[in-house]
Interface confidence: low
């Protein structure tokens, strides 16, 4: 996976004159029709209930820092994470719940019971997805909580836990 | 979140004189790449199968009427819609099921069983999504049928049941 | 369902001259802002672990061939399956899985654990799915492993098991 | 810590119907499983099945025909029936607490079928 | 009703040896295998439960690994009292299901 520089803003863009000139292909490849995405996987090592990301996967026009996606350009973004769990069931039933936060507030969340006959199976094996479509300004963080981190399964499945976003539509 | 003002249609697009004249970063905003999206919560009170919606959401070149979503410009779309149900088990099992209409026709459908185990628990919770890729023409509208409308948990949730559509391709 | 034919490459586009002239929406019509879209349907009949496809679903820009989609346009793609499962459970529990493969390598998988009690129930219903957001290249191919596709429901849910990728942003 | 105790006769008679009782101390039975294994003089291991709390059973095919197991909460038991024993039923008897796999064994019950 | 398969059935060996022993199931089983310890006239201890994970108070000397099919318990020193008949148990399917048993005796 490669993480991609963001390329120049549209306040760049040589509309008229300047490299561009009048070379109508230059100019579309370089009109501001933004596009910014993120695909990070679950760090290995998961000790609270935020959860935290691997930033060397794909981001382009969006920053990672401390388990925050942070929005760089302004626009209606849509955002999905997906969550591998593999309980060891108790005696009891579990509740997995995944929530979505827009600068720590929780907009969106998912929740699905485990173990819900009360037997004990050796393992059982559950995938959550959670999809958001917001508008997000620059500077806004995207982040996951996760009550039950400790059944997000890292190791068996270290590629199956994301968090997605991608710009839709830019507010210009 | 808000509503968002239909923009002018692609025909009223001045590409040659009129306000844009020669301003290329005019005309490239303006240009027929057109963008439509809808982001509806459901309604807090569900009395039938069809479900209802908050039209106070994200609406984007997109009507809300009656339960439906009504399109407004041809192209290709993106249709999701996600619910979180919350089940006071009997002593059988229940089969939950969302059901995406396309012009009052059942175009795709997801089930999942819960409460297998047939024991009374105090609750299992349970989330669904459906996703639909297709060509829509004008007036097409969207619709979501769920049997056990019941279970959907407007109180706890009210933020978790969503049906989102949005343009991809357009007609041109 | 329609398919479509692909559009000419953006190397095609008269950007001066030609037929487009000095008609800028002909222009912007015909620029390199590629969309490559594809939406197929599992096939009726399956008999081994890699699923095949009703090729006469929505192809655009990109191929199918021997249960794999294959890529037209190099960039960014947004890929998601989505099954409907009907399970028979046995006396033991049964872990569905769904493995998505680009150029036959396992990238991401959903497992879900049904019939977890243990106790024979005539059926239970499982959806699953899954998504992934990757850089494919040309000729770069797309499947799906199932492990137990004889649970994959074709007869009652024929249009409910599909296989969807589309271009966000093309390397140009 | 946890510990069990098989008890019942240990001959009887063929045709007749073994009966054992496993009292479980240290610890709650509520919200685990609870098993039989037995092991005929010389050879392997054989799980006969076992009971939840709430009464749920599961029992080896090979035996179904001829075993119930029942449980008693209030007094910290649960216990085998076997009927029509014949011979080849003449094994030591474990309980064992069947968690993530069988954590905790009693001691074990020698029973013999002879007339 | 799974088969498990357990060899050897029985295996000479020195105090300070490494020994492994190895269970085949006829089926897939995922990690729902334990392995227990068992002494003349005693019962079975648990050694290692869902494949590899080392139960409460077992010495680390003893290790499981598998692969769904293919399980191995290893002991990596022997010492004077590992000697005894070990067995694997299946618990995924119905019903439960025990290997024939591997004696370990002193060479």
């Known amino acids: 996976q490669r993480t991609d520089s963001i390329p120049n803003s549209p306040d760049n863009i040589p509309l008229r004159g300047g490299n561009c000139s009048e070379d109508l292909l230059c100019i579309l490849k370089r009109a501001p029709f933004k596009k910014s995405w993120a695909y990070l996987q679950v760090a290995k090592h998961l000790n609270k209930t935020k959860l935290s990301w691997n930033k060397d996967g794909i981001l382009h026009g969006v920053r990672y820092q401390d388990g925050n996606l942070v929005i760089q350009f302004p626009g209606l973004y849509f955002i999905i994470c997906q969550l591998q769990f593999l309980v060891q069931c108790p005696n009891n039933s579990v509740d997995l719940k995944l929530e979505l936060l827009i600068n720590k507030h929780i907009k969106k969340q998912a929740l699905v019971t485990v173990c819900e006959s009360g037997m004990q199976t050796k393992h059982v094996y559950q995938n959550l997805s959670q999809f958001l479509l917001d508008y997000l300004q620059v500077n806004t963080t995207v982040s996951v909580n996760v009550d039950t981190f400790q059944y997000i399964d890292t190791s068996t499945f270290p590629l199956e836990n994301v968090l997605s976003v991608f710009l839709y539509s830019n507010s210009d | 979140q808000r509503t968002d003002s239909i923009p002018n249609s692609p025909d009223n697009i001045p590409l040659r004189g009129g306000n844009c004249s020669e301003d290329l970063l005019c005309i490239l905003k303006r240009a027929p790449f057109k963008k439509s999206w809808a982001y509806l919560q459901v309604a807090k009170h569900l009395n039938k199968t069809k479900l209802s919606w908050n039209k106070d959401g994200i609406l984007h070149g997109v009507r809300y009427q009656d339960g439906n979503l009504v399109i407004q410009f041809p192209g290709l779309y993106f249709i999701i819609c996600q619910l979180q149900f919350l089940v006071q088990c009997p002593n059988n099992s229940v089969d939950l099921k969302l059901e995406l209409l396309i012009n009052k026709h059942i175009k795709k459908q997801a089930l999942v069983t819960v409460c297998e185990s047939g024991m009374q628990t105090k609750h299992v919770y349970q989330n669904l999504s459906q996703f639909l890729l297709d060509y829509l023409q004008v007036n097409t509208t969207v619709s979501v049928n769920v049997d056990t409308f019941q279970y959907i948990d407007t109180s706890t949730f009210p933020l978790e049941n969503v049906l989102s559509v949005f343009l991809y391709s357009n007609s041109d | 369902q329609r398919t479509d034919s692909i559009p000419n490459s953006p190397d095609n586009i008269p950007l001066r001259g030609g037929n487009c002239s000095e008609d800028l929406l002909c222009i912007l019509k015909r620029a390199p802002f590629k969309k490559s879209w594809a939406y197929l349907q599992v096939a009726k009949h399956l008999n081994k672990t890699k699923l095949s496809w009703n090729k006469d679903g929505i192809l655009h820009g990109v191929r199918y061939q021997d249960g794999n989609l294959v890529i037209q346009f190099p960039g960014l793609y947004f890929i998601i399956c989505q099954l409907q499962f009907l399970v028979q459970c046995p006396n033991n529990s049964v872990d569905l899985k769904l493995e998505l493969l680009i150029n036959k390598h396992i990238k991401k998988q959903a497992l879900v654990t049904v019939c977890e009690s243990g106790m024979q129930t005539k059926h239970v219903y499982q959806n699953l799915s899954q998504f992934l957001l990757d850089y494919l290249q040309v000729n770069t191919t797309v499947s799906v492993n199932v492990d137990t596709f004889q649970y994959i429901d074709t007869s009652t849910f024929p249009l409910e098991n599909v296989l969807s990728v589309f271009l966000y942003s093309n390397s140009d | 810590q946890v510990q069990l105790q098989e008890s019942g006769p240990g001959l009887v008679k063929p045709s007749e119907t073994l009966s054992l009782t496993c009292t479980v101390s240290?610890?709650?039975?509520?919200?685990?499983?609870w098993s039989w294994i037995r092991q005929p003089p010389g050879k392997g291991l054989e799980w006969i099945g076992y009971i939840f709390y709430s009464g749920y059973t599961k029992y080896n095919p090979s035996l179904k025909s001829r075993v119930t197991i029942s449980v008693d909460t209030s007094k910290n038991q649960f216990s085998l029936k076997l009927s029509s024993v014949t011979a080849a039923d003449t094994a030591v008897y474990y309980c064992?607490?069947?968690?993530?796999?069988?954590?905790?064994w009693g001691q074990g019950t020698l029973v013999t079928v002879s007339s | 009703a799974i088969q498990m398969t357990q060899s050897p059935s029985s295996l000479s060996a020195s105090v300070g040896d490494r020994v492994t022993i190895t269970c085949r199931a006829s089926?897939?089983?995922?990690?729902?295998l334990g392995w227990y310890q068992q002494k003349p006239g005693k019962a079975p201890k648990l050694l290692i439960y869902?494949?590899?994970s080392l139960q409460s108070g077992v010495p680390s000397r003893f290790s499981g690994s598998g692969s769904g099919t293919d399980f191995t318990l290893t002991i990596s020193s022997l010492q004077p009292e590992d000697f005894a008949t070990y067995y694997c148990?299946?618990?995924?399917?119905?019903?439960?299901?025990f290997g024939q048993g591997t004696k370990l005796e002193i060479k």
């Open positions: 064992a607490r069947d968690r993530w796999d069988f954590d905790y």
């Open positions: 148990l299946q618990d995924f399917n119905y019903p439960y299901t």
């Open positions: 869902a494949e590899s």
């Open positions: 089926q897939g089983i995922r990690n729902n």
């Open positions: 240290g610890g709650s039975i509520s919200g685990y499983y």
